[in-house]
Structure formats: structure tokens, C-alpha cells
């Protein structure tokens, strides 16, 4: 279960392992997610990250001690929209939210190094937000795709 109040809310630019920027572009009245090279002086799109604490059942071997850090993400341009994991076609999409985000909008935050994080789908364990063909998609973690699921959060 995810504990109600957010631990932290922060605004960051999201970039890939290869230093491409994740941006949100308005097309036909809807935002789409792009992954593209960003010029040195070009302003990067920001994401609003809301951090939550999640505890989970005792069978994990950690008893009540087991806690994960979850995030949900919105473009700063429109914080009523959430990044959503679509388990039907393994895509990442933006969805207009209800009062509270669904499970598909929560991602377990993995700190892979001091600089890079990964986002594991709460509702699809072992599946992460990754980069495929200049788009965000859901990918399973393996050695070949390791860098594809690494993202840098830069506080602007």
C-alpha cells in the first residue's frame, strides 16, 4: 500500500543515459513524450516528481521493515496528467488523471548510481521505463538494455 502523503515533491529535468532529453510536446491538443537531443542552451522540459513511501507484505522476508520509494510523474506544463505504464502494448503514455493516480502511474525508484535512477512499474515488477526508438517504452531489465533504463534527474 502507498502511504497517503507525499514525502517530497520536486521539479527536475529528465534525461537519458545518452544525455538526450525527455520532453513533452503538444500535438493536436494532447501531450506526447519525445526523447531527443537537446541543445546546450535550450531550456529542458521539467517533470514534477512526487515521492511516496510504500510498505508491502511480510512474505518479502523483511517483515514490516520492507519499504520502497515510489514516484509518480507529471509534465510541469500540466500537472493533472501522469506518466502511465500501459501493460497492453508496453508503452508509456500521458493520461489525464482522476483524483488519485492509478497503480499504473506509480514507479518504484531504483537508485542505480549516485547519478542515475531507474523507474520500475509498480504493477509490472521487473519492467522499467526505457528508451526505444526515441520514445519511452516499457522494457524488461537485462544486460543489453541496462543503459536504456537509466535516467538522470537534474534539479533546475
Amino acid at each position: 500500500s502507498i502511504q497517503g502523503t507525499s514525502l517530497l515533491t520536486e521539479s527536475c529535468a529528465l534525461s537519458t543515459y545518452n544525455d538526450q532529453s525527455v520532453s513533452f510536446v503538444l500535438e493536436n491538443g494532447c501531450y506526447v513524450i519525445n526523447v531527443e537531443d537537446c541543445g546546450k542552451n535550450q531550456e529542458k522540459d521539467k517533470v514534477l516528481l512526487r515521492y511516496y513511501e510504500s510498505s508491502f507484505p511480510a512474505q518479502s522476508g523483511d517483515g514490516v521493515d520492507g519499504k520502497k520509494l515510489m514516484v509518480n510523474m507529471s509534465p510541469i506544463k500540466d500537472t493533472d496528467i501522469w506518466l502511465n505504464a500501459n501493460d497492453k502494448d508496453y508503452s508509456v503514455e500521458l493520461q489525464k488523471g482522476d483524483v488519485s493516480p492509478p497503480d499504473q502511474a506509480f514507479f518504484v525508484l531504483h537508485k542505480k548510481s549516485s547519478d542515475f535512477v531507474s523507474f520500475e512499474c509498480k504493477n509490472l515488477p521487473g519492467t522499467y521505463i526505457g528508451v526505444k526508438d526515441n520514445q519511452l517504452a516499457l522494457v524488461e531489465e537485462n544486460d543489453e538494455s541496462c543503459n536504456n533504463i537509466m535516467f538522470k534527474l537534474s534539479k533546475m
Epitope: L8, V108, L109, S114
Partner: antibody
Framework: EVQLVESGGGLVQPGTSLKLSCLAS????????MTWIRQAPGKGLEWIAS????????YYPDSVKGRFTISRDDAKSTLYLQMNSLRSEDTATYYC???????????????WGQGTLVTVSS | DIQMTQSPASLSASLGETVSIECLAS??????LAWYQQKSGKSPQLLIY???RLQDGVPSRFSGSGSGTRFSLKISGMQPEDEADYFC?????????FGSGTKLEIK
């Protein structure tokens, strides 16, 4: 119950080496970042080394970089600190600590071992 | 490096008194700030994380607040068992850094 038990401390001469161990139990070891923190007698706390939950990344302050190495053996649920070229200023109680959340470093250190004393003196 | 300046260095308080300890960071960061209590001869114990979250099992007389560069720990109603050293720690940026500590004694 989460337990962290350090061992390997003792009296050593300057310039020599020592390896500390920390045996972890009561939690899924390979899901957590682990960290060594030390405290010189009568002084404050100093972060010494951290290792990612995968073991793929290690981090040190300048004061020990190149001399100390943190490592982990997930099969044995054990954390290590290899200390080389020891100096008198490395004299301290060394604590093994565990992060608050799976896969992460956010949220401080809720679990600490009892500490092991390292004395570097000729 | 983020320097954590903790004040006061020492403090004596009467039983039941409300006590505050402050930590000032050399640069602003998100709320990854923890407070620890260390009793004589013992390992430190986490009291507060995420600047204001009370760690499980910690009495509710302890509270944390602050953001950016200024953080504080408050003990509302000093108890005999609160006599200890207190440290703040930032986890936002490597190297991780601690405040130099506050020694809290009973008057």
C-alpha cells in the same frame, strides 16, 4: 529482526591494512544500499563508503579514496571494508549501516551495527 | 561538498522543557535530511528522516521541520532519556555529510 554485526577491528600499525566485515541478517540484503560510517573517539560522525544494492557502484569521500574499498558478498549477506595504508587519523569506531528503502539511498540510516573499534598506532 | 553547520554545540534543558536544534546547509537541497540520537557508548539511532518523518518507534515528542538550507529538530517536553548527542545528516548529494553534533544535557 534486522541485525548488523561488525567484526575485524583491532590495533594496527600505521601503513598496514585491515579488513572489516559486517554480517547482515533479518532482511533481504541484496535489495539495499549499504554504507560504512565512522566515529573518531569523542568526535562526530563521518561517512566513509557506500555501495549500491547491485554492487556495481561504490562511493567514497576524498579522505579515504584510493585507500579504502567497500565490497559486498550477497550470497553471504556480508559487507566488507578493506582498509589499506592506515593512518593514525583513521582511528575510530566503524559502523555498518543499511539504507531506509529498497534500492535507494533516500531517508537516512535506520539500522546500525554495534561498531568495531580500529586503533592505528605505533 | 554540502557543509552542515549545527547549533548549538551543547545545550542543557530542564525536564519538560521544549528544546530546538538547528542545522544550516551551505547550499539548498531537497528534504533528504535525517536526525540521529546517540546515547553514550551506543550506536546512533535514526529519529527523523525526510526532514519531518518520524521513524517507527520514536516518541512523538520528537519532530523535524525545514527545507532548503534550514532544518530543525524539536523535542517537546524534555525527558531524562533524551540526554544524548544529536546529529543531522544530508543524503541529497555525495559526499554524505553530518553536522558536528549537539550535546543535550539535563539541567
Amino acid at each position: 529482526e534486522v541485525q548488523l554485526v561488525e567484526s575485524g577491528g583491532g590495533l594496527v600499525q600505521p601503513g598496514t591494512s585491515l579488513k572489516l566485515s559486517c554480517l547482515a541478517s533479518g532482511f533481504t540484503f541484496n535489495n539495499y544500499w549499504m554504507t560504512w560510517i565512522r566515529q573518531a573517539p569523542g568526535k562526530g560522525l563521518e561517512w566513509i563508503a557506500s555501495i549500491t544494492y547491485t554492487g556495481g557502484g561504490t562511493y567514497y569521500p576524498d579522505s579515504v579514496k584510493g585507500r579504502f574499498t567497500i565490497s559486498r558478498d550477497d550470497a553471504k549477506s556480508t559487507l566488507y571494508l578493506q582498509m589499506n595504508s592506515l593512518r593514525s587519523e583513521d582511528t575510530a569506531t566503524y559502523y555498518c549501516t543499511r539504507a531506509n528503502y529498497y534500492y535507494n539511498t533516500y531517508g537516512g540510516f535506520p539500522y546500525w551495527g554495534q561498531g568495531t573499534l580500529v586503533t592505528v598506532s605505533s | 561538498d554540502i557543509q552542515m553547520t549545527q547549533s548549538p554545540a551543547s545545550l542543557s534543558a530542564s525536564l519538560g522543557e521544549t528544546v530546538s536544534i538547528e542545522c544550516l546547509a551551505s547550499e539548498g537541497f531537497s528534504n533528504d535530511l535525517a536526525w540521529y540520537q546517540q546515547k553514550s557508548g551506543k550506536s546512533p539511532q535514526l529519529l527523523i528522516y525526510a526532514a519531518s518523518r518520524l521513524q517507527d518507534g520514536v516518541p512523538s515528542r520528537f519532530s523535524g521541520s525545514g527545507s532548503g538550507t534550514r532544518f530543525s529538530l524539536k523535542i517537546s517536553g524534555m525527558q531524562p532519556e533524551d540526554e544524548a548527542d544529536y546529529f543531522c545528516q544530508q543524503g541529497s548529494k555525495y559526499p554524505l555529510t553530518f553536522g558536528s553534533g549537539t550535546k543535550l544535557e539535563i539541567k
